[in-house]
């Protein structure tokens, strides 16, 4: 998924169904948020780069008992080639920065949207 939907090739290619569903789930979370997401839980910020799916999962998996992001956690696990468990961290984490889950989800969504617009919006 480093190519992310095929933008390395000429002309834009829409995302796979799985990635489309992940984006839609992130949209649902950000748009339907009423009370503080996951009771305002904090997670490690990540570098939104090539291995971001695993890094995102490693960060979010440390949030337990939050049904609002369970589907996102499951979806991210489908994009990560290795098994991720709580307390596991990669070099992609910005270990000195913690942010609220709501902000984490919003940042991830914005980054995915930017990636898909690359190569078509000049």
């Amino acid at each position: 998924l480093t190519c992310l939907g095929g933008f390395a090739s000429p002309g834009p290619v829409p995302p796979s169904t799985a990635l489309r569903e992940l984006i839609e789930e992130l949209v649902n979370i950000t748009q339907n948020q009423k009370a503080p997401l996951c009771n305002g839980s904090m997670v490690w910020s990540i570098n939104l780069t090539a291995g971001m799916y695993c890094a995102a999962l490693e960060s979010l998996i440390n949030v337990s008992g939050c049904s609002a992001i369970e589907k996102t956690q499951r979806m991210l696990s489908g994009f990560c080639p290795h098994k991720v468990s709580a307390g596991q961290f990669s070099s992609l984490h910005v270990r000195d920065t913690k942010i609220e889950v709501a902000q984490f989800v919003k940042d991830l969504l914005l980054h995915l949207k930017k990636l898909f617009r690359e190569g078509q919006f000049n």
């Epitope: 002309g11 834009p12 829409p14 995302p15 489309r20 949207k113 898909f116 617009r117 919006f121």
Partner: antibody, heavy 119, light 107 residues
Amino acid sequence: QVQLVQSGAEVKKPGASVKVSCKASGYTFIDYEIHWVRQAPGQGLEWMGAIDPETGGTAYNQKFKGRVTMTTDTSTSTAYMELRSLRSDDTAVYYCTRILLYYYPMDYWGQGTLVTVSS
Amino acid sequence: EIVLTQSPATLSLSPGERATLSCRASQNISDYLHWYQQKPGQAPRLLIYYASQSISGIPARFSGSGSGTDFTLTISSLEPEDFAVYYCQNGHSFPLTLGGGTKVEIK
């Protein structure tokens, strides 16, 4: 509720330019692309192009490249479409519409702006 | 550029009848196909997205099917307010393109 409100009808002479506005409300403006679609009298719908309000990045239909410019003003949540060197066959209703990402559907539309090009 | 061909151009039916509208893409667009309804003097209205996904507020009599290059919009039982023009739209790649439309008129 989501609303896209467009500017009023315009009558222009051939060779002139027109600038149509589209004011968005009821959602976070930078979260959605704004696309422009036109419809000549009695004809079908034609996609003109799009703008990402967050970055100002644009994508234009080749047919209109060089004649069209799409811009946004995020402070007022307004999108603009300027079409230059107008011809009689540019007479049409111009619609703005929003899309979350280009492959999504156009879920909300403006009411349309009739642009008449006549000498 | 992906070309969408809608057929028939005009469909003459009576209220209560079933309407079947076709949209054919010039290349594989998976399920990135959306349907809109347009009534005279009005902006188009989204009916179906991703070929078969329904929209809240749209009556259940509207349904979509298909994938790849062949798509269908079905209106199970026509109501008087359904007589309008229907357009399909390619959401697969730029330039976004729309079919020429199918006019559903009262017989």
